[in-house]
Amino acid sequence: REAAPKSYAIRDSRQMVWVLSGNSLIAAPLSRSIKPVTLHLIACRDTEFSDKEKGNMVYLGIKGKDLCLFCAEIQGKPTLQLKEKNIMDLYVEKKAQKPFLFFHNKEGSTSVFQSVSYPGWFIATSTTSGQPIFLTKERGITNNTNFYLDSVE
């Protein structure tokens, strides 16, 4: 059977959800007036960069859009971006596409996503509404790096 990405709804402990604004991902408080994105997640087949202690290597995309999460250095700082790319195009590549890869690790009932390109940098939401989803190496009070994933049909 051909592999297919799994679909998840994502929120943090403060009920901030991910919303597409143009070609950017922002965090906004859950409400009836916003439409959260559904995350596509698929495991990478190439094991070159694998590290079981850090979690499973996955590609992350936005369901219904040819957009995938991608890490790049901008002005010397690891930055999270969306790139026009079909998640299945990444999956079928024999060689791991490192900038698009994240370690997906479970911490209790939550999920954590760490950049493979930039170890120690995690996908995060700010405590402030309307801010972009970003990468941080400071896990804690001001940045939320733990997310609840709910499987979506």
Partner: antibody
């Protein structure tokens, strides 16, 4: 199996209030919103409002604003809809319906309905 | 409020027929449209969400299509248990609004 069980039929006088309950079982209450939808005899469906128990936020249709109050008790996984200043046009079957938090407005599980009759 | 208009309001069909019901929104609702089936004395049942996604447990003879303002529910081969009233509903913005319903009757 997720179920929404509503309270029984009510007969009310014009000007009075009615409170209908909706008890959820078989799912995580906080992962869902609950909306209330009514249907007058032989008529279509009308959304009244809904609550997100996890946040305690409530939205109402303008038509019912000030006359309807929707609440939820997470400890008992029960939602409530109170409609005041009842008139004969409020005679209808009142349904509660569940919505996943990530797809608000898509009612995937419904209660059995509660008939409210307003008559003098 | 967004107005939802269904057509036809009723139709007669036979078992095995292909049935199409349309729904038009008064303004764009993207793909934020659901379809429900309701039988007399029963609560509505979600068939299709997000215009074209089949709800779990719903037979594959039901399908939905469309985006923007024009939407279609298709029953590829009508079965005896499909005789009911069908409603479209938008969830693009509140208040959520329903179409007036389409009653599918036995010819």
């Amino acid at each position: 199996q997720v179920q929404l069980v509503q309270s029984g039929a009510e007969v009310k006088k014009p000007g009075s209030s009615v409170k209908v309950s909706c008890k959820a079982s078989g799912g995580t209450f906080s992962n869902y919103a609950i909306s209330w939808v009514r249907q007058a005899p032989g008529q279509g469906l009308e959304w009244m409002g809904g609550i997100l128990p996890i946040l305690g936020t409530v939205d109402y249709a303008q038509k019912f604003q000030g006359r309807v109050t929707i609440t939820a008790d997470e400890s008992t996984s029960t939602a409530y809809m109170e409609l005041s200043s009842l008139r004969s046009e409020d005679t209808a079957v009142y349904y509660c319906a569940r919505e996943p938090w990530y797809r608000l407005g898509a009612f995937d599980v419904w209660g059995q309905g509660t008939l409210v009759t307003v008559s003098s | 409020d967004i107005q939802m208009t269904q057509s036809p309001s009723s139709l007669s069909a036979s078992v095995g027929d292909r049935v199409t019901i349309t729904c038009r929104a008064s303004q764009t609702i993207y793909k934020y449209l659901n379809w429900y089936q309701q039988k007399p004395g029963k609560a509505p049942k979600l068939l299709i969400y997000a215009a074209s996604s089949l709800q779990s447990g719903v037979p594959s003879r039901f399908s939905g299509s469309g985006s923007g303002t024009d939407f279609t529910l298709t029953i590829s081969s009508l079965q005896p248990e499909d005789f009911a009233t069908y409603y479209c509903q938008q969830y693009s913005s509140i208040p959520y609004t329903f179409g007036q319903g389409t009653k599918v009757e036995i010819k």
